[in-house]
Interface confidence: low
């Protein structure tokens, strides 16, 4: 049988041994910053080049001399997971190893920085194809390490890191907290978050996705043919580095933003049992388990979007929270959420030449989150149209008036501490889909975009009786760009997108009456790009296909029983 | 890595006269900030990453590092420049007493200083 983890990352319709071609990832170079490695291990021999880079602290303790080739253990296993002949994800990827962790698996921020600088200099001296950097390490939050990762990412390098094994918020650790890095948590064969002793995988808004990270069979440094099972978010990150190498090998021109969106898009959704996470982290933690794409063709036409949560604003009255998209992404909508329900909405505003999503706390509130919907929309021209609070009692409205602009999201923001629930909800008059409607005391912000072939439609799901959660989803072929609530009254805790579903949360049913005051409508804006679909069809017609699909029928990899050596 | 403190001490003394005339006040603008790991056992006091403002050139980084050494020497402190960064971030890695942080934060071009800390295999 094939190891569970390789089976898990294979799309359902394919057999893992047929799917993972022997030369997958061959156009990509993966840098591994870790311990020393046993480069003559049969799994990775000839695939991993050990660079002369070494920057490690001295080992602690007096009994160190008795640990010998434990020095190679962590790095060898991870190199095997990324590119191992039998148990690797991207069997064709070539790797370069830098030693930044000592024999006890310990390194320094400064050593890691110098390692990242070494990679950047190597890239400048000898530019190669796509680069993936795997950082299977974590320390406390570090501004400088995050900054270095940001610079390297902006130089076109894909960085993948472990979320950390501390059963804690990944945002408290680096490089896991760096927004430009792809941060990976660990799940097990049951798609549950991995428990490691008394701790386990990190979680929270800084995690991009999860991947297999428990009982992972890979190269053991004990001998050149040994295999061992290891667990941790490092193993999970190694899977994603391998998947990234496969994707980049099939589409070398992918940007970091495109790669991240594809990783999210092709992940298995909603399979993780969220009960394992602390209650306040569940909504922030992505319920995604990484998988290889079924094929690279057919992905190009899709409008890809992801949800980005801000840090918590904190409880002060005027506190705000800001969520930002990556440089190559468009902010198509902005929403907010507060567990206490005390918030003053959200608005899209320009900051440094880019739109950001800002949420506002209210007096007595415990704080808010801003939630940005970040999408890949080439040649988009987006702007925000604002209507101040209405004089009349009909409510505030704003629409996209420019020719060719479509509505992608609605936000509302109010200065009053409590909008009150005494007014009946204002529903959008039919036949005016390009319009945002809100409470008369709120200012309304419409995100209006023009992009070739972009079309959007509004979907609403109203519930007359109070309910803690109202959802509305976009149908197949459409992507959720906007998610908001009508009427935005004080019992609404907020709205946010989960994959292609708009979720509106309200205060506990028991605290709201069952009158019309409890009525809530979830409003989803669903978009698609005819232009992207067309371009993709043209591409498929004009190429003989260099994607993963065309190498599916490549040589089958047998998984021999003796590889279960430590299993 | 062998300790080169002997050689380095001579270098510091040689730098003293060269740098004595330099002004110690930072450039106008925001004050540089100091950061350290929130997890106490992971801190590595005594080694600091001095990060300079974004457009600082390598020569300015080296000059700033030398200036720090000279000013520290004037106060009787030994410092050791372990690495000068360029390519990703401008700055340098310095081994020095924490007593010198206030001085280092006032150096020209300094954006922020971070105390070194541990990272671990996951």
């Amino acid at each position: 049988s094939i190891p569970w983890n390789l089976e898990r990352i294979t799309p359902p319709r394919y057999r893992a041994d047929e799917y993972q071609p022997p030369d997958g990832g061959s156009l990509v170079e993966v840098y591994l910053l870790d311990t020393s490695i046993q480069s003559d291990h049969r799994e990775i021999e000839g695939r991993v080049m050990v660079t002369d880079f070494e920057n490690v602290p001295e080992e602690d303790g007096t009994r160190f001399h008795r640990q010998a080739s434990k020095c190679d253990s962590h790095g060898t296993h991870l190199a095997g997971v990324v590119s191992g002949r039998d148990a690797g994800v991207a069997k064709g990827a070539s790797m370069r190893s830098l030693r930044v962790l000592n024999c006890q698996g310990k390194g320094t921020v400064s050593g890691t920085l110098i390692g990242l600088e070494f990679i950047r200099k190597s890239q400048l001296v000898q530019p190669v194809g796509p680069l993936v950097v795997l950082l299977p390490l974590a320390g406390g939050y570090s501004r400088v390490l995050n900054a270095a990762c940001q610079r390297l990412a902006r130089a076109g390098v894909v960085l993948v890191t472990a979320a950390g094994n501390f059963r804690d918020d990944a945002c408290l650790y680096s490089p896991a907290s760096a927004p430009e890095v792809i941060t990976v948590g660990a799940t097990n064969a049951q798609d549950q978050p991995v428990t490691l002793g008394t701790l386990g995988t990190n979680f929270g808004r800084c995690v991009d996705l999860f991947a297999p990270g428990e009982d992972i069979i890979g190269a053991s440094s004990d001998c050149s043919t040994c295999f061992v099972s290891q667990s941790g978010t490092s193993q999970a990150a190694a899977h994603v580095a391998g998947i990234a190498a496969m994707m980049l090998s099939a589409e070398p021109e992918l940007t970091l933003a495109e790669l991240r969106q594809r990783l999210i898009h092709f992940s298995a959704k909603d399979v993780i049992n969220e009960a394992w996470f602390p209650e306040d982290q569940r909504v922030l933690t992505p319920n995604l388990v990484a998988a290889l794409p079924p094929s690279t063709h057919g992905a190009g036409w899709q409008l890809f979007c992801r949800t980005v949560w801000s840090a918590h604003s904190g409880p002060t009255r005027m506190a705000t929270a800001v969520a930002r998209c990556a440089p190559d992404e468009e902010l198509l909508s902005c929403s907010s959420f507060s567990r206490s329900g005390k918030r003053r909405g959200e608005r899209m505003e320009a900051q440094g030449g880019k739109l950001v999503c800002r949420a506002h706390n209210a007096f007595g509130g415990e704080g808010v989150y801003a939630i940005a919907r970040c999408c890949l929309l080439p040649q988009a021209n987006c702007s925000v149209h604002t209507a101040p609070p209405a004089e009349a009692s009909m409510g505030t409205r704003v629409h996209c008036h420019q020719q060719g602009h479509v509505l992608t999201g609605c936000s509302s923001h109010w200065e009053v501490e409590d909008l009150g629930t005494h007014k009946p909800p204002v529903l959008r008059p039919r036949g005016q889909p390009n319009q945002c409607v809100g409470h008369r005391e709120a200012s309304i912000h419409a995100s209006c975009c023009h992009a070739p072939g972009l079309e959007c439609k509004v979907k609403e799901h109203g519930i007359p009786a109070p309910q803690e959660q109202v959802t509305v989803a976009c149908e197949e072929g459409w992507t959720l760009t906007g998610c908001s609530a009508l009427p935005g009254t004080s019992h609404v805790l907020g709205a946010y997108a989960v994959d292609n579903t708009c979720v509106v949360r309200s205060r506990d049913v028991s605290t709201t009456g069952s009158t019309s005051e409890g009525a809530v409508t979830a409003v989803a804006i669903c978009c698609r790009s005819r232009h992207l679909a067309q371009a993709s069809q043209e591409l498929q017609g004009s190429t003989s296909g260099s994607g993963l699909n065309d190498i599916f029928e490549a040589q089958k990899i047998e998984w021999h029983e003796h590889h279960h050596h430590h299993h | 890595q062998e300790d080169e403190d002997g050689d380095y001490e001579e270098l510091v003394l040689a730098l003293r006269s060269e740098e004595d005339g330099l002004a110690e006040a930072p450039e106008h603008g925001t004050t540089a900030t100091f950061h350290r790991c929130a997890k106490d056992p992971w801190r590595l006091p005594g080694t600091y990453v001095v990060v300079l403002k974004e457009e600082t050139h390598l020569s300015q980084s080296e000059r700033t590092a030398r200036r720090l050494q000279a000013q520290a020497a004037r106060r009787g402190y030994l410092t050791k420049i372990l690495h000068v960064f360029h390519g990703l971030l401008p700055g340098f890695l310095v081994k020095m007493s924490g007593d010198l942080l206030e001085l280092a934060l006032k150096l020209p071009h300094v954006d922020y200083i971070e105390e070194d800390s541990s990272v671990f295999a996951q």
Partner: antibody, heavy 121, light 112 residues
């Protein structure tokens, strides 16, 4: 001081199961792998498998993998080895032995005193 | 599986003698990166648990008298007791840990 104390001798009938315990003291239980080695009367030493107390991960020798189960209870720093479907040739002294450092297959620096298991009808 | 062959299976010697026990493995036990041989020697007295003497083919465990020494590399290894003491009469086992674990069949050292 560091020691491994095993449970007492057992007499079992063929087909039955036996569960031997090994209580560790004087060190951090989860920092060392625990191995089980047996020795039939007048014979040499035979390695059976190990458990990593920190993760619960086990590896069994091919000859035993269908019949042996190794477990641990970290709260009481105890490792267990259960052998099922006992045969008369399972009569042996069973030792637990600690292996320094979690994933290094080097050597066993501390051993239990041994538990005699007799299988007889 | 790696096979370990010890010789002789038994030997008689007197106090003060120099004794050599050899151990051959069916494949090399040398890890090419660490340059360590994954071979250990144990001493076992009747009714007692084995005791570690030597690891990595030649490194003495702390507390082991220096009359015990280990040598060899690759597939051929030797345990030498330079001057036998009364407490040294026991059975000695070699063990490989290069690929899982295998013990040699043992060498019984008896008083002549």
């Amino acid at each position: 001081q560091v020691q491994l104390v095993q449970s007492g001798a057992e007499v079992k009938k063929p087909g039955a199961s036996v569960k031997v315990s090994c209580k560790a003291s004087g060190y951090t239980f989860t920092d060392y792998w625990m191995h089980w080695v047996r020795q039939a009367p007048g014979q040499g030493l035979e390695w059976m498998g190990y458990i990593n107390p920190s993760s619960g991960f086990t590896k069994y020798h091919q000859n035993f993998k269908d019949r042996v189960t190794m477990t641990r209870d970290t709260s009481i720093s105890t490792a267990y080895m259960e052998l099922s479907r006992l045969r008369s040739d399972d009569t042996a002294v069973y030792y637990c032995a600690r292996q320094y450092d979690y994933d290094e297959d080097w050597y066993f620096d501390v051993w239990g005193q041994g538990t005699t298991v007799t299988v007889s009808s | 599986d790696i096979q370990m062959t010890q010789s002789p299976s038994s030997l008689s010697a007197s106090v003060g003698d120099r004794v050599t026990i050899t151990c051959k493995s069916s494949q090399s036990l040398l890890n090419s990166r660490t340059r360590k041989n994954f071979l250990a020697w144990y001493q076992q007295k009747p009714g007692k648990a084995p005791k570690l003497l030597i690891y990595w083919a030649s490194t003495r465990e702390s507390g082991v008298p220096d009359r015990f020494s280990g040598s060899g590399s690759g597939t051929d290894f030797t345990l030498t007791i330079s001057s036998l003491q009364p407490e040294d009469f026991a059975t000695y086992y070699c063990k490989q840990s290069f690929n899982l674990f295998t013990f040699g069949q043992g060498t019984k050292l008896e008083i002549k």
